[in-house]
C-alpha cells in the first residue's frame, strides 16, 4: 500500500477519489434497492441520481444478488433484528471494527459492511428517523476510506469484487459473508 497519501495521477480505478466515488455510488444504489424491496417509498433515499457506467452497473448487480442471498439467512436476520439502535453510531463502528479486527481484508467483509449499513438504514426508516440515512451512509464511507481504501487500491479497485463473487461458488462465499457479520454482531451483543 502506498503510504504517500497522494492521489495517483489521472483518477484511474485505483485512485483514492475514484474508489470513494464508486463506493458512494454502490452504497447508495445498494441501500435504495434494499429499501425498494421492502415496498416502502422512501423520499429520504431520493439522493442525487448519478449515471452509472457499465462496470459500476455490473458491480451493483453483483451486490444486489448477494443482498438477496443474505436476506434469506434467518440467523443473520434474527441477529440484526436484535440490534439496539439507541446508539447507532456506537453499534455501527464497533461491529465494523470487529469485522476487520484480525487485519484480514476480503471482498466478503466489504460487502458485509454495506449490508449491515443497509440494515441500519432500513431500521431508521421503520422507526421514522430519516435523517439517520445519510448519516449511516457517511459512517460507512468514512470507515471505507480510513480502513479499507488502501486494501481496495491493492486489489486494483472495485472490479476485484466481480472476480471474487464471479465464481460458480458465490453462494458459498455469501454464506461466509453472513458468518462474518453474525460473528461480529454476536461479539457486539456480548460487549454491549
Amino acid at each position: 500500500m502506498d503510504g504517500s497519501g497522494e492521489q495517483p495521477r489521472g483518477g484511474g480505478p485505483t485512485s483514492s477519489e475514484q474508489i470513494m466515488k464508486t463506493g458512494a455510488l454502490l452504497l447508495q444504489g445498494f441501500i435504495q434497492d434494499r429499501a425498494g424491496r421492502m415496498g416502502g417509498e422512501a423520499p429520504e433515499l431520493a439522493l442525487d441520481p448519478v449515471p452509472q457506467d457499465a462496470s459500476t452497473k455490473k458491480l451493483s448487480e453483483c451486490l444486489k444478488r448477494i443482498g438477496d442471498e443474505l436476506d434469506s439467512n434467518m440467523e443473520l436476520q434474527r441477529m440484526i433484528a436484535a440490534v439496539d439502535t439507541d446508539s447507532p453510531r456506537e453499534v455501527f463502528f464497533r461491529v465494523a471494527a470487529d469485522m476487520f479486527s484480525d487485519g484480514n481484508f476480503n471482498w466478503g467483509r466489504v460487502v458485509a459492511l454495506f449490508y449491515f449499513a443497509s440494515k441500519l438504514v432500513l431500521k431508521a426508516l421503520c422507526t421514522k428517523v430519516p435523517e439517520l440515512i445519510r448519516t449511516i451512509m457517511g459512517w460507512t464511507l468514512d470507515f471505507l476510506r480510513e480502513r479499507l481504501l488502501g486494501w481496495i487500491q491493492d486489489q486494483g479497485g472495485w472490479d476485484g469484487l466481480l472476480s471474487y463473487f464471479g465464481t460458480p461458488t458465490w453462494q458459498t462465499v455469501t454464506i461466509f459473508v453472513a458468518g462474518v457479520l453474525t460473528a461480529s454482531l454476536t461479539i457486539w451483543k456480548k460487549m454491549g
Epitope: M1, G3, G5, Q7, S16, E17, M20, K21, A24, R89, E90, F92, F93, A97, F100, S101, G103, R134, T135, M137, G138, W139, L141, D142, R145, E146, R147, L149, G150
Partner: antibody, heavy 117, light 110 residues
Framework: EVQLVESGGGLVQPGGSLRLSCAAS????????IHWVRQAPGKGLEWVAS????????YYADSVKGRFTISADTSKNTAYLQMNSLRAEDTAVYYC??????????WGQGTLVTVSS | DIQMTQSPSSLSASVGDRVTITCRAS??????VAWYQQKPGKAPKLLIY???SLYSGVPSRFSGSRSGTDFTLTISSLQPEDFATYYC????????????FGQGTKVEIK
C-alpha cells in the same frame, strides 16, 4: 502539492466566538476527511472534531460538543471550525489535518487561539 | 472510551541507541494506529500508519509493530534529528472520540 493553511486564530474573551478556516489545496476535500486537533501550551495533542464533506459526517470530542461546529465549503475546498462559548481551557494552537488510512498525513502550520479576559 | 496509554512519558538516550516507545490500548482496537514526531513550535509529522506501514519519506530506522493491544514504535539507531516528542494515535469511533492520542513521549539527549 498537498497543503493545508489555517487562519482565524487570535485573542478572544471568555464566552466569545471565533471561526477558524482551513484552506486545502492539492486534493479535493469532498472525498477526504478533515480534522481539527489542538495543543494547549506545553501539553499533548487533543482531537477536537472532524468532517467528511461528501455525506456531511461530523464528529466531535465531548469537551467541545454543543459549543463548536465543524463545516466545509467544497466549492472553496475549505473546512471551518466555529467556536462559541469559548473558555480559558480552549486556549491552544489549533491544527487542521487530513486523514488517510486512519492516520493524519498532512497538517497545517497551526493557528493560536487565546481565550483570556 | 478507548484510552491509549503511552510509555514512557520521557526518556534519555544517546545517538546510536535503540529506542522503543509503547502504546497500550485499553480495549481491543483495529490496526488503525499511527505514530507521529513533533518538534517544538512545529506541526506533528506522520511516521507510521496502519500500525506498521512506514510513511513515504520517513527513514527506515523507524518501524512500528503490534502485539495484541500493544503498539510499539522503534527507532533502531537514534540520530541527532530524532530528539523530539512522539505520539501514538488510534482511529475508530469510541463513544466520544473518532481519534485518540497517547499522552506523548519526549526523547531527550542523555
Amino acid at each position: 502539492e498537498v497543503q493545508l493553511v489555517e487562519s482565524g486564530g487570535g485573542l478572544v474573551q471568555p464566552g466569545g466566538s471565533l471561526r477558524l478556516s482551513c484552506a486545502a489545496s492539492g486534493f479535493n476535500i469532498s472525498y477526504s476527511s478533515i480534522h481539527w486537533v489542538r495543543q494547549a501550551p506545553g501539553k499533548g495533542l487533543e482531537w477536537v472534531a472532524s468532517i467528511s464533506p461528501y455525506y456531511g459526517s461530523t464528529y466531535y470530542a465531548d469537551s467541545v460538543k454543543g459549543r463548536f461546529t465543524i463545516s466545509a465549503d467544497t466549492s472553496k475546498n475549505t473546512a471551518y471550525l466555529q467556536m462559541n462559548s469559548l473558555r480559558a481551557e480552549d486556549t491552544a494552537v489549533y491544527y487542521c489535518a487530513r486523514s488517510h488510512f486512519g492516520a493524519l498525513d498532512y497538517w497545517g502550520q497551526g493557528t493560536l487561539v487565546t481565550v483570556s479576559s | 472510551d478507548i484510552q491509549m496509554t503511552q510509555s514512557p512519558s520521557s526518556l534519555s538516550a544517546s545517538v546510536g541507541d535503540r529506542v522503543t516507545i509503547t502504546c497500550r490500548a485499553s480495549q481491543s482496537v483495529s490496526s488503525a494506529v499511527a505514530w507521529y514526531q513533533q518538534k517544538p513550535g512545529k506541526a506533528p509529522k506522520l511516521l507510521i500508519y496502519s500500525a506498521s506501514s512506514l510513511y513515504s519519506g520517513v527513514p527506515s530506522r523507524f518501524s512500528g509493530s503490534r502485539s495484541g493491544t500493544d503498539f510499539t514504535l522503534t527507532i533502531s539507531s537514534l540520530q541527532p534529528e530524532d530528539f523530539a516528542t512522539y505520539y501514538c494515535q488510534q482511529w475508530g469511533y469510541s463513544h466520544s472520540h473518532l481519534i485518540t492520542f497517547g499522552q506523548g513521549t519526549k526523547v531527550e539527549i542523555k
